[in-house]
């Protein structure tokens, strides 16, 4: 039975040509984390971070993501192009599959708002 | 390019317990971040994942079996195992060890790449 | 567990046609997913991964496709060697789970 739940920094917002931190956390449930998967909006993967295996970034990420901190990413140098939906996806064993959602806007650096808990100065 | 080759009895008496062994050549089992994997096919059947251990010795057994699996690794002989306990005739098949992952770090997958020749093991009084 | 489903069953091709297989997932399973070729008294070989990319000497005329819950393995011009049994499997989600097989005969 799956128990757990998936927290997220929800909607986020963050500079254009600046970095951000995407974070998904499971909670409330006992099940081991196997592997993390961060999907893009148009269902590419960015990166997979494997407990076993450990990282792999995309090739076409390959500049613009770095892994971490812990099982979350880091894109960089964001563009207008980056504004979108996010998926964690959580493979757990016994457990399952969770999945997470964030929201992303890339906003001209005149008028960004961000929240600074997750934000790259 | 490691190699998996499998060994073990090919006969094991109903109720006994199925025990069976993957040598690893080509490459060292401890310093290699994979999952090392048993996956059998009983005959003209289908084939059916038994379970996996990583580098990390977590094991993930599949369900309908985990009460009577145990996957091991003797990284001093190269080696992992497979142990299946109280075995009966639907246990009979082809017994295959396999690596999962060995082209993650590349390509970013997770599958079975490399596998053993396989085993045949018949359970039978 | 993900439940996977091939169909056909079986199917007869003559060489040099094109062979077409299916592969269903209980729930989806995003791209997770590889397709495996077994000729009798062999393992299994590696095909397929990521649904759609050809592991390492796959010859091009082997090509994956789909995502989510419906797959298609695609053999375009069928050589004597291909005929043999394909399984489909998703991965990472545990437990591993593979599809019951489709046979490609010489019809």
């Known amino acids: 039975m799956m128990t757990g739940t998936i927290e997220t920094t929800g909607n986020i917002s963050a500079k254009k040509g600046g970095s951000v931190i995407l974070q998904c956390h499971l909670s409330s449930t006992m099940a081991q984390v196997t592997q993390v998967n961060w999907e893009q909006h148009d269902h590419s993967l960015l990166a997979i971070r494997n407990a076993e295996l450990g990282w792999h970034i995309y090739p076409a990420f390959k500049d613009r993501v770095a892994p971490g901190p812990g099982l979350g990413l880091t894109l960089q140098s964001l563009t207008m192009n980056d504004t979108g939906e996010y998926f964690c996806t959580y493979h757990t064993y016994p457990d399952g599959t969770y999945r997470g959602r964030i929201f992303l806007e890339v906003l001209e650096s005149s008028v960004a708002e961000h929240s600074a808990r997750f934000q790259i100065p | 390019q490691l190699q998996l080759q499998e060994s073990g009895p090919g006969l094991v008496k109903p109720s006994e317990t199925l025990s069976l062994t993957c040598t690893v050549s080509?490459?060292?089992?401890?310093?290699?971040?994979?999952?090392w994997a048993w996956i059998r096919q009983p005959p003209g059947k289908g084939l059916e994942w038994i379970g996996s251990i990583g580098t990390s010795g977590s094991t993930y057994y599949n369900p309908s079996l985990k009460s009577r699996v145990t996957i091991s690794v003797d990284t001093s002989k190269n080696q992992f195992s497979l142990k299946l306990s109280s075995v009966t005739a639907t246990d009979t098949a082809v017994y295959y060890c396999a690596i999962e992952g060995a082209n993650f770090r590349d390509f970013g997958y997770v599958a079975f790449d490399i596998w053993g020749q396989g085993t045949m093991v018949t359970v039978s009084s | 567990e993900i439940v996977m489903t091939q169909s056909p069953a079986t199917l007869s091709v003559s060489p040099g046609e094109r062979a077409t297989l299916s592969c269903r997932a209980s729930?989806?399973?995003?791209?997770?997913l590889a397709w495996y070729q077994q000729k009798p008294g062999q393992a299994p070989r590696l095909l397929i991964y990521?649904?759609?990319t050809r592991a390492t000497g796959i010859p091009a005329r082997f090509s994956g496709s789909g995502s989510g819950t419906e797959f298609t393995l695609t053999i375009s011009s069928l050589q004597s060697e291909d005929f043999a049994v394909y399984y489909c499997?998703?991965?990472?989600?545990?437990?591993?789970?593979f599809g019951g097989g489709t046979k490609v005969e010489i019809k």
């Open positions: 499997q998703q991965s990472p989600p545990w437990p591993r789970t």
């Open positions: 990521g649904a759609s």
């Open positions: 080509g490459g060292s089992i401890s310093s290699s971040r994979y999952y």
């Open positions: 729930q989806s399973v995003s791209s997770n």
